[in-house]
């Protein structure tokens, strides 16, 4: 039978508002049918929408009645309308896209790392620290020390010595491990993995006990 276009999967078109983090891929679908087979076109905020209108372009998959945008950015926010038509009629559906900018945050350290260790005098020890960060993180391994019998400075901040810092020649894997060789009783104490980026620092600590 000949006839105007109609939606073939209206249940898949219920979600009219789509909010996605920046850099994600977005796909809008308007599965339809009709006789003759209808055409599909897309509008953004009521105007014709073509690939040259956005950096990275768009993918129009007519067989799947879909519009795909990869690596969305805040400027992709807006109302997207599919227009499905043949000579007997026209139908349309509007979706609203919101692009969520990822809020920058301090590095995130994996829970439970580094872990407390007990080692025999003269043995080797490794502390591990797993860091997740959007912005490039810098990692420092710190050893807590005493100064004139005190563990903290005049303002209450703990005294520390830097054991290892991120370097241009240091891989993430190297940084995420602190290796102590041939441990002595002086190596016993508190160790901290400190990760920083432009937002701030995060830190986890662990203790080393050295047995005779």
């Amino acid at each position: 039978d000949t006839g105007a276009p109609y939606w073939t999967r209206p249940e898949r078109m219920d979600k009219k508002l789509l909010a996605v983090p920046a850099a994600n891929t977005v796909r809008f679908r308007c599965p339809a049918a009709g006789n003759p087979t209808p055409s599909i076109s897309w509008l953004k905020n009521g105007r014709e929408f073509r690939g040259e209108h956005r950096i990275g372009g768009i993918k129009l998959r007519h067989q799947q009645w879909s519009l795909v945008m990869e690596s969305v950015v805040p400027s992709d926010r807006g109302n997207y309308t599919c227009v499905v038509e043949n000579k007997f009629g026209s139908i349309r559906q509007t979706y609203t896209l919101d692009v969520l900018e990822r809020s920058p945050h301090r590095p995130i350290l994996q829970a439970g790392l580094p872990a407390n260790q007990t080692a025999v005098l003269g043995s080797d020890v490794e502390f591990h620290c797993k860091v997740y960060s959007d912005a490039q993180p810098h990692i420092q391994w710190l050893k807590h020390v005493e100064v004139n019998g005190s563990k903290v400075g005049p303002d209450g901040t703990p005294y520390v010595t830097v054991l290892k810092t991120a370097g241009a020649n240091t891989t993430d894997k190297e940084l995420e491990v602190l290796s102590l060789h041939n441990v002595t009783f002086e190596d016993a104490g508190e160790y901290t993995c400190l990760a920083g980026n432009s937002i701030g620092f995060s830190h986890h600590s662990a203790w080393l006990v050295v047995l005779p």
């Epitope: 420092q140 400075g153 209450g156 010595t161 810092t165 020649n169 400190l194 920083g196 432009s198 830190h203």
Partner: antibody, heavy 126, light 109 residues
């Protein structure tokens, strides 16, 4: 990006005081130490002290004890260095400098200065 | 104040390698890997070139390298270029900052 913007040049009379400001942007001000370093004309770098913007704690070089005061205003991400009882030999460019070390700790060994302000020329002349 | 000792000046021709030394004691340079190097062009603020003896910050040319032997740290600049002409300062952190006296690098020719 990290920026440290200092106040403008000052001319002071001997015996007076000067207060230099340093506005930080591009990072969380309270997370990193701020150091002050000066450089007399044609001379090398001379460390004056640091302030922990998180706690307000300070550590001054022995040479400047009693004459220097370092403060901060976290609401506007700004550090200040005030030097009193000025003499002609205090004529120098004064730099604020961010120290790569978390303000949660007191660094006994290690750490380094990674960003510097543009410098403030203080001239002491009668 | 304790200071680190640097030569007052060094020079080299374009394309050559030069090394600037920074001598301290076993309490600072010798005992720990905490020496930084800064480059300062006339009228400009210092710029971090090397930290923790041999680490290069991102954006610094790999022509700059750092090392340490005993109580002496060294900054080596290979493939010398005209824009390398500047003052260079070493620095160590031990409770407080200690700077070297500075070395003036002249690029000849």
């Amino acid at each position: 990006q990290v920026q440290l913007v200092q106040s403008g040049a000052e001319v002071k009379k001997p015996g007076a005081s000067v207060k230099v400001s340093c506005k930080a942007s591009g990072y969380t001000f309270t997370s990193y130490y701020m150091h002050w370093v000066r450089q007399a004309p044609g001379q090398g770098l001379e460390w004056m002290g640091w302030i922990n913007p998180n706690s307000g704690g300070t550590n001054y070089a022995q040479k400047f004890q009693g004459r220097v005061t370092m403060t901060r205003d976290t609401s506007i991400s700004t550090a200040y260095m005030e030097l009193s009882s000025l003499r002609s030999e205090d004529t120098a460019v004064y730099y604020c400098a961010r120290y790569y070390g978390s303000s949660l700790y007191h660094y006994v060994f290690g750490g380094f200065i990674d960003y510097w302000g543009q410098g403030t020329l203080v001239t002491v002349s009668s | 104040d304790i200071a680190l000792t640097q030569p007052a000046s060094v020079s080299g021709s374009p394309g050559q390698s030069i090394t600037i030394s920074c001598t301290g004691t076993s309490s600072d340079v010798g005992g720990y890997n905490y020496v930084s190097w800064y480059q300062q062009h006339p009228g400009k603020a210092p710029k971090l070139m090397i930290y923790d003896v041999s680490n290069r910050p991102s954006g610094v040319s790999n022509r700059f390298s750092g090392s340490k032997s005993g109580n002496t740290a060294s900054l080596t600049i290979s493939g010398l270029q005209a824009e390398d002409e500047a003052d260079y300062y070493c620095q160590s952190h031990h409770f407080y900052e200690v700077f070297g006296g500075g070395t003036k690098l002249t690029v000849l020719g």
